[in-house]
Interface confidence: low
């Protein structure tokens, strides 16, 4: 059945709850220098309005402290508000690495990003940090790389690899939750001139994804501790008719086409699918088309395979997908698939259709087909045109946690967190946001704190408090002694 | 400090080519992009292109793609432009210049020019 | 590709007096990749405000950018004689880079 009446029960108290971010581009310099500027000035304010120094006088002046850059001000405003465990956010491979090499680190970006972290964590927030987050036309790719063919050139796996480990290195003693790479199984929309040249790029961010854990494995961990993964789109699919075998073949294929691509290779046997591959060089023999995906050597099936320390999708809604022959040597006409709008359905304004139970089968399907893995949701979410009154998202927030509360309760399915997208939105977007572009908040952030304070949809006489334990007192205390030591 | 030194001027005739030089010092060569800049007497500049000494990706002004040739040497810290089948059109002053990145993508540091003039 | 029209061409000023000079963008551009320059006859030309309204290191606070969009300015409080100059826009938001025409700035 799709839908199966609601829930009531709790999810685990090591449950994430979290709020996504996309890119945090840094502040270049901390925006509060009256603290840092020992002078003394005269403000003439009838003349000609200049501030003019006071020779000879100094005052005294503080440290510079994280909370001088505005920007981190407003975003622990919003955190605090929204009550969450955990923040999602991206760091930009741009800023911190300009030449996309180590020969100029931009150490102020990485403070900031620091300040992120840690004033997060005075607040309780601990981070999730993305390394490589693409969101725009040139890719968030230092220029160097972008300029050298950008994810068409293997050399650009071996500079995120270097990337990655600076970041661990800075980062990694405050970050314990890493994604390298997020929705690589996106970037067919950018890489799209030819099927060859989306597998290929797509074959080079796994590479880069599996050097960077790699990285981590064998030189991060043993003192840090952490755990590294990768984030793949992954929107379920169904066939728009139910009664055709073709459209069921194509909903499968779909879910091949987008997730095992990325999750066979990494999770599994550290190659394409087979179901996949097969289907593409079926299409090369009958001249539909000269895509083809890259053969891997034993030693990239061994570098890739086992290469995630737990599962991170993001999921916002399902497709309905039919079955149509395309001609055409592309990723989207190599699938064969045509996606069905259901007009019938609830959907946002960028015509996301609300529907929940997608999130449990899409859980079901990944531990069936990866088995039972630590599985979070790494962004979730929908638009929603209200600026003070969101309904919708209070509409999709509820029933989407009460399927993820199913898969965990009834399904067993081995569920760690859910991060809501987004935490603000961007001018002249699609409005994700809890907050508004002028930081104004919405009413689904008190809802979204009602299921957190409940850790989910408990039974009245439930208690939702959960006991501090041991280890989480030392993760967060211990944590400040270790920082503020001299 | 961070200095470009640009190579002498030359008295070329019509249908030659000249390769002129940019030296930098002061930084690390390969991490920045060199530009080259035209700018005829009386008139403004013309942005003829780029390129990144640290992997050798360059980019031309369509205008001037038959024209100019870049390359660089990262051993000896050089730029340099070839300019083929001069012209009259092509006596001007050239500049290099070092560039930044996205946010910081300004001309911070100049050469002094290289004067070429085309005359039979 | 983006053409960036400066005006006036010429102008002269006493000193003292206030200078606007204007560069208008044939399409809208981010404010962060519009940069003016000042260059001096026999001189290379010099970054003088970077992201449309930011002073480069060493230029004096009577200079002032600002702007948006398709429609960008430098302004001086008080022309100074080491003012006069040529003054170009740039801009960084799309290949092929330009830039203006420039306006040559002299004093009375």
């Known amino acids: 059945k799709e839908s199966t009446p609601d829930v009531q029960g709790q999810f685990p108290c090591d449950f994430s709850w979290g709020v996504t971010e996309s890119v945090l581009k840094p502040e270049s310099v901390a925006s509060s220098p009256q603290f840092s500027d020992p002078h003394l000035y005269v403000w003439n304010a009838t003349g000609n309005r200049l501030l003019h120094r006071v020779e000879g006088v100094r005052l005294k002046t503080r440290p510079a402290q994280c909370t001088d850059f505005v920007n981190i001000k407003k975003q622990l405003e919003m955190l605090a508000r929204m009550k969450v465990t955990h923040y999602r956010f991206a760091l930009d491979w741009a800023s911190v690495l300009p030449t996309g090499n180590l020969s100029a680190v931009n150490r102020q970006a990485l403070r900031y990003y620091r300040c992120v972290v840690s004033e997060g964590l005075k607040l309780g927030i601990s981070a999730m940090v993305t390394l490589y987050y693409p969101t725009h036309a040139h890719l968030g790719l230092p220029e160097p790389l972008l300029h050298a063919d950008g994810w068409l050139n293997p050399s650009t796996a071996e500079a995120f690899q270097a990337y990655a480990g600076l970041c661990f290195q800075e980062l990694g003693d405050l970050v314990k939750l890493w994604i390298t790479i997020n929705e690589p199984n996106r970037l067919s929309d950018i890489y799209n001139r030819s099927g060859n040249d989306t597998y290929g790029a797509a074959h080079n961010l796994l590479v880069a994804h599996a050097l960077a854990w790699r990285l981590y494995d064998r030189q991060f961990r043993p003192s840090q501790r952490g755990a590294v993964s990768l984030s793949l789109h992954a929107d379920w699919a169904e066939p728009a008719n139910p009664y055709a075998d073709s459209h069921w073949r194509a909903a499968e294929r779909f879910l091949q086409f987008e997730i095992a691509w990325f999750a066979e290779p990494l999770f599994k046997t550290g190659d394409y699918p087979a179901a996949m591959r097969e289907y593409i060089a079926s299409k090369h023999r009958r001249g539909l088309s000269s895509s083809a995906l890259p053969r891997l050597t034993e030693a990239e099936r061994r570098l890739l395979k086992g290469t995630v320390d737990f599962c991170a999708l993001n999921h916002f809604t399902t497709r309905f997908v039919m079955h149509e022959q395309l001609a055409g040597s592309r990723y989207d006409s190599d699938r064969d698939i045509q996606f069905l709008q259901d007009i019938t359905r609830l959907s946002s304004p960028t015509r996301l259709a609300v529907i929940p139970w997608g999130v449990r089968k899409l859980l079901r399907w990944v531990r069936r087909n990866y088995g039972d893995m630590d599985i979070y949701i790494t962004a979730s979410g929908i638009d929603d045109q209200a600026l003070e009154d969101d309904r919708l998202r209070k509409y999709y927030l509820g029933k989407y946690l009460q399927e993820v509360l199913k898969a965990y309760l009834i399904d067993k399915v081995r569920i760690k967190g859910y991060y809501a997208f987004k935490l603000a939105e961007e001018k002249s977007k699609p409005r994700f946001g809890f907050f508004t572009s002028d930081f104004k908040a919405k009413s689904s952030i008190q809802f979204y704190n009602k299921v957190i304070s409940s850790r989910g949809f408990p039974f009245e006489n439930s208690s939702s408090r959960c006991s501090q334990t041991q280890e989480n007192t030392e993760c967060t205390v211990c944590l400040f002694l270790v920082q503020k030591k001299p | 400090q961070i200095q470009l030194q640009q190579s002498g001027a030359e008295l070329m005739k019509p249908g030659a080519s000249v390769r002129m030089s940019c030296k930098a010092s002061g930084y690390t060569f390969s991490s920045y992009w060199i530009e080259w800049v035209k700018q005829r007497s009386g008139h403004g500049l013309e942005w003829i292109g780029e390129?990144?000494?640290?992997?050798?990706?360059?980019i031309y002004n369509e205008n001037f793609r038959d024209k100019a040739t870049f390359t660089a040497d990262t051993s000896s810290n050089t730029a340099y432009m070839q300019l083929s089948s001069l012209t009259s059109e092509d006596s001007a002053v050239y500049f290099c210049?070092?560039?930044?990145?996205?946010?910081?993508?300004?001309?911070?540091?100049w050469g002094q020019g290289t004067l070429v003039t085309v005359s039979a | 590709q983006i053409v960036l029209t400066q005006s006036p061409a010429i102008m002269s000023a006493s000193p003292g007096e206030r200078v606007t000079l204007t560069c208008s963008a044939s399409?809208?551009?981010?404010?962060?990749?519009l940069y003016w320059y000042q260059q001096k006859p026999g001189s290379s030309p010099k970054l003088w405000i970077y992201g449309a309204s930011n002073l480069a290191s060493g230029v004096p606070g009577r200079f002032s950018g600002s702007g948006s969009g398709t429609s960008y300015s430098l302004t001086i409080s008080s022309m100074e004689a080491e003012d006069a100059a040529s003054y170009f826009c740039h801009q960084w938001s799309s290949y092929p880079l330009t830039f203006g025409s420039g306006t040559k700035l002299e004093l009375k």
């Open positions: 399409s809208s551009l981010s404010s962060s990749y």
């Open positions: 210049a070092r560039r930044g990145y996205y946010d910081a993508a300004w001309f911070d540091y």
């Open positions: 390129i990144f000494p640290g992997g050798g990706s360059t």
